[in-house]
Amino acid sequence: AFGISGVQKYTRALHDSSITGISPITEYLASLSTYNDQSITFALEDESYEIYVEDLKKDEKKDKVLLSYYESQHPSNESGDGVDGKMLMVTLSPTKDFWLHANNKEHSVELHKCEKPLPDQAFFVLHNMHSNCVSFECKTDPGVFIGVKDNHLALIKVDSSENLCTENILFKLSET
């Protein structure tokens, strides 16, 4: 398991315009866990990173992920309700130069090494769908969310807004 060194453990405003022409409005270093309090961990295996969903032992340190938050304008012609709206998008980086990516063909979530500007597959629309939990919707595939399947992260299609509170797409962010 690994974390990110040298990043402040609180949110900070940034002045960095290098990512797709927009700067993150803030960044936040946090551990990611499921609704049922299993930890999301990252391990280097055979020169590639694997993502696991597991119960940690009592004093085992949680892996941290750097979440970068971006504000995105959503044009009224896409929003369907005739008004321009704003939404929050995030990228998630568990270690330097690696970001979570949505692989829509394989319905999988993968860690890819890439340079900025990041591809759209690395961006997720942030949802607060349940008290103090968040969900991550693929920018490239609306209605598809990061979720938990067989102790791994996977992409899960959510058919209706009533299913947005389903536990397997809910995550908790914690600084500890």
């Epitope: 609180y10 949110t11 900070r12 405003a13 409005i25 803030t26 936040y28 938050y69 504000e71 959503h74 929003s79 369907g80 309700d81 005739g82 008004v83 709206g85 704003k86 939404m87 929050l88 629309v125 942030l126 949802h127 607060n128 769908m129 349940h130 008290s131 103090n132 919707e137 807004s161 009533e162 947005l164 509170c165 600084e175």
Partner: antibody, heavy 121, light 106 residues
Framework: QVQLKESGPGLVAPSHSLSITCNVS????????VHWIRQIPGRGLDWLGV???????GYNSALMSRLSISKDSSKSQVFLKMNDLRTDDTAVYFC???????????????WGQGTLVTVSA | DIQMTQSPASQSASLGESVTITCLAS??????LAWYRQQPGKSPQLLIY???RLADGVPSRFSGSGSGTEFSFKINNLQAEDFVSYYC?????????FGGGTRLEM
């Protein structure tokens, strides 16, 4: 154009219940959360609760047992119901909309004009 | 629940001056803090969100700073319409609590 408008009973007797309707237009309740906030005359703001875009609710811990929030999406209405009213529930009640789609992190740009509810015998 | 402690409760200032209001959160809230202005008999107006972002149409004499647990809000070059009440609110976690407010007096 985004609008929220509260309509309430004005006067409620102690121990009775309060129902306020928030009529919204210019946006979809499936995309934005709607919150209820109240302000006792001459005092500060109290957050009461939220109905999130996905349908889940969150409430003020101290008032949770007396509050419920629901919606009728087909009529673009959000409802606040509060039971067992006391005189110190006298306040202006506001409904407000999230700034961001799907998320409350951005605060509240759009507010209703508020409806004054007086609890008195 | 997260407690928000806003200070001062009231402050006197003159036209053209600058004032600063602070808000302390009882636990870390990242950058998820908003500042509102409220004129008497009116609904509050969002001025700053995400701790530092100016809401649409808000003059640049308003600014916000801070992260974690300590936040501040500054008004430069005070105008007559600024002598009203101001509130902070944390939006990191439900319940989304407000500070007690600051009344700005001339």
């Amino acid at each position: 154009q985004v609008q929220l408008k509260e309509s309430g009973p004005g006067l409620v007797a102690p121990s009775h219940s309060l129902s306020i309707t928030c009529n919204v237009s210019g946006f979809s309740l499936s995309k934005y959360g709607v919150h209820w906030i109240r302000q006792i005359p001459g005092r500060g703001l109290d957050w009461l609760g939220v109905l999130r875009a996905g349908g889940s609710t969150g409430y003020n811990s101290a008032l949770m047992s007396r509050l419920s929030i629901s919606k009728d999406s087909s009529k673009s209405q959000v409802f606040l119901k509060m039971n067992d009213l006391r005189t110190d529930d006298t306040a202006v009640y506001f409904c407000v909309r999230d700034h961001y789609y799907y998320s409350s992190y951005g605060g509240f740009v759009y507010w209703g004009q508020g409806t004054l509810v007086t609890v008195s015998a | 629940d997260i407690q928000m402690t806003q200070s001062p409760a009231s402050q006197s200032a003159s036209l053209g001056e600058s004032v600063t209001i602070t808000c302390l959160a009882s636990q870390t809230i990242g950058a998820w803090l908003a500042w509102y202005r409220q004129q008497p008999g009116k609904s509050p107006q969002l001025l700053i969100y995400a701790a530092t972002r100016l809401a649409d149409g808000v003059p640049s004499r308003f600014s916000g700073s801070g992260s974690g647990t300590e936040f501040s809000f500054k008004i430069n070059n005070l105008q007559a319409e600024d002598f009203v009440s101001y509130y902070c609110q944390q939006l990191d976690s439900s319940p989304y609590t407000f500070g007690g407010g600051t009344r700005l007096e001339m």
